[in-house]
Interface confidence: low
């Protein structure tokens, strides 16, 4: 009679994580008598998966009834597969011996590959805000997928980006893999409403990629432009001076009026108007009592935006003597100079 052969017909089996793997094994003969054992891996460090004779293997069930005398089907099912179960499984026939059974013949092995979905991509941007025309880096990470083949793409507002570097780790064989990608994105003034998207495609996703997003509103700082203008006289001896603060983001902004270099009022932008591009506008104004000044007044609008160094714009207010004031005595001039000379108002548009 021909010597017993152990046949594992499947060289490889591919199973999705969470499903059940069937590992097939048949023997060509009932002789010699002895049990079957299943191992993962070969050599001294191999891991016992199932022993027909003894032991408790809660995740393993046999396909056939191994207690029947004429059974030659030693296939098993392993439930709730995870990436950690990946490896090569060997069906090994033992010959009954004393005191221990002796290994007789092994099958060729079946490689179990586990398909595991990648985790939802997590996109993170720079720690500090940056201004338009700067390039910032975004990272995208996804973990726990198998097999290793994976595709990652970057988009900004639907437009595919090309300036990125991607690594899949580890380089060698592993039960599961991680992907890490860094993309460079050039900021523009219109990016307050922009999104950066990382898209991951994998065999387990069946054509429906996973996406991670980051809003550039958390990354961009658009510095304001300032314009100080003198409005027509509102009342006798009073001039209205406005400071227009335009196109800034985020909203955090503090404005200080300086009169000849001395702080006269500080206020925080509250009721702002939003532009279509997501940036903000704000306006502050002062009423200046020109009769209280003998000399020209330098009014400065100083703005500190989002904790950045202050920017400022100045306006020289020309003080010319009014006809009715001509010939006024020194005492009257002194009295005038003691009056509070700037009336502070702010107005939101």
């Amino acid at each position: 009679e021909e010597e017993l052969q152990v046949i594992q017909p499947d060289k490889s089996v591919l199973v999705a994580a969470g499903e059940t793997a069937t590992l097939r094994c048949t023997a060509t003969s009932l002789i010699p008598v002895g049990p079957i054992q299943w191992f993962r891996g070969a050599g001294p460090g191999r891991e016992l998966i199932y022993n027909q004779k003894e032991g408790h293997f809660p995740r393993v069930t046999t396909v056939s009834d191994l207690t029947k005398r004429n059974n030659m089907d030693f296939s098993i099912r392993i439930g709730n597969i995870t990436p950690a179960d990946a490896g090569t499984y060997y069906c090994v026939k033992f010959r009954k011996g004393s005191p221990d059974d002796v290994e007789f013949k092994s099958g060729a092995g079946t490689e179990l590959s586990v398909r595991a979905k990648p985790s939802a991509p997590v996109v993170s941007g720079p720690a500090a805000r940056a201004t338009p025309q700067h390039t910032v880096s975004f990272t995208c990470e996804s973990h726990g997928f198998s097999p290793r083949d994976i595709t990652l793409k970057w988009f900004k507002n639907g437009n595919e980006l090309s300036d990125f570097q991607t690594n899949v780790d580890p380089v060698g064989e592993s039960v599961s893999y991680s992907i890490h990608s860094t993309a460079k994105v050039v900021l523009t003034r219109e990016d307050v409403h922009s999104q950066v998207i990382c898209e991951v495609a994998h065999v387990t996703l069946q054509g429906d990629p996973l996406r991670g997003t980051a809003n550039l509103s958390e990354t961009i700082r658009v510095p304001p432009t300032l314009e100080v203008t003198q409005q027509p006289v509102r009342a006798e001896n009073q001039v209205n001076v406005t400071c227009q603060v335009r196109k800034f983001y985020p909203q955090r902004l503090q404005l200080t009026w300086l009169e000849n270099g001395n702080v006269s009022r500080t206020e925080t932008a509250s009721t702002v108007t939003e532009n279509k591009d997501g940036t903000y506008n704000w306006m502050s104004w002062l009423l200046v009592n020109v009769s209280a000044h003998r000399d020209d007044v330098k009014l400065t609008c100083q703005v500190e935006h989002d904790g950045q160094p202050a920017v400022s714009k100045s306006h020289d207010l020309k003080v010319s003597a009014h006809p009715k004031e001509q010939g006024s005595n020194t005492a009257a001039e002194n009295t005038g100079s003691n009056e509070r000379n700037i009336y502070h108002h702010h107005h939101h548009h």
């Epitope: 940056a130 201004t131 338009p132 025309q133 700067h134 390039t135 090309s162 300036d163 570097q165 460079k184 050039v186 900021l187 523009t188 003034r189 510095p223």
Partner: antibody, heavy 123, light 107 residues
Framework: QIQLVQSGSELKKPGASVKVSCRAG????????MNWVRQAPGQGLEWMGF????????TYAQGFKGRFVFSLDTSVSTAYLQIGSLKAEDTAVYYC????????????????WGQGTLVTVSS | DIQMTQSPSSLSASVGDRVTITCRAS??????LAWYQQKPGKAPKSLIY???YRYIGVPSRFSGSGSGTDFTLTISSLQPEDFATYYC?????????FGQGTKLEIK
């Protein structure tokens, strides 16, 4: 279509100054930084620096601080390079080149170039 | 400053040849490397950025590779219009620096 159009050749005497213009077309000037690159006769390319066209902030390479000034006139979508106190060794072709982006610490690749302006300094 | 060294300085080749130009940086520049082509009397033309990416309109016979300190520009099959001087440029660190150029001539 994107193009950078530079002003014509200049012949100057030593000690004079020159202003080279670079007009941006097909895109918004203030969306991309502008670089200036020098190429002396028969020599390679030398980066002079760039200007952040959004803030107007210039950055000069070490050998180009002092006599060289980058400026903008956004109303006519034009960047300028002005060179003062010209010397014979300033004779070169000067190129403006648009940066793909303005980088904090990693510079930028240039995607579009002007046609170049030859500045000749001779007595 | 980061020094960029190209080799060879000049190279003779024939139409249809495969040509490789190398560029070595004096320190790690990651993939922040660009390649430019310049013909006599003309402005440089941008070919490659981020070491490997071709600009739109650049023929596929041009390819870039490398990272860190060693980079390569390969022209898979030389065409008559490819005879020119080629420059590499690093943009990892200020000041931006160029290689000295490689002149590609007709054999």
């Amino acid at each position: 279509q994107i193009q950078l159009v530079q002003s014509g050749s200049e012949l100057k005497k030593p000690g004079a100054s020159v202003k080279v213009s670079c007009r941006a077309g097909g895109y918004t000037l203030t969306d991309y930084a502008m670089n200036w690159v020098r190429q002396a006769p028969g020599q390679g390319l030398e980066w002079m620096g760039f200007i952040n066209t959004y803030t107007g902030e210039p950055t000069y390479a070490q050998g180009f601080k002092g006599r060289f000034v980058f400026s903008l006139d956004t109303s006519v979508s034009t960047a300028y390079l002005q060179i003062g106190s010209l010397k014979a060794e300033d004779t070169a072709v000067y190129y403006c080149a648009r940066t793909r982006g303005y980088y904090d610490f990693d510079g930028g690749a240039f995607d579009y170039w002007g046609q170049g302006t030859l500045v000749t300094v001779s007595s | 400053d980061i020094q960029m060294t190209q080799s060879p300085s000049s190279l003779s080749a024939s139409v249809g040849d495969r040509v490789t130009i190398t560029c070595r940086a004096s320190q790690n520049v990651g993939t922040h490397l660009a390649w430019y082509q310049q013909k006599p009397g003309k402005a440089p033309k941008s070919l490659i950025y981020s070491a490997i990416y071709r600009y739109i309109g650049v023929p596929s016979r041009f390819s870039g590779s490398g990272s860190g300190t060693d980079f390569t520009l390969t022209i898979s099959s030389l065409q008559p219009e490819d005879f020119a001087t080629y420059y590499c440029q690093q943009y990892n660190t200020y000041p931006l620096t160029f290689g000295q150029g490689t002149k590609l001539e007709i054999k």
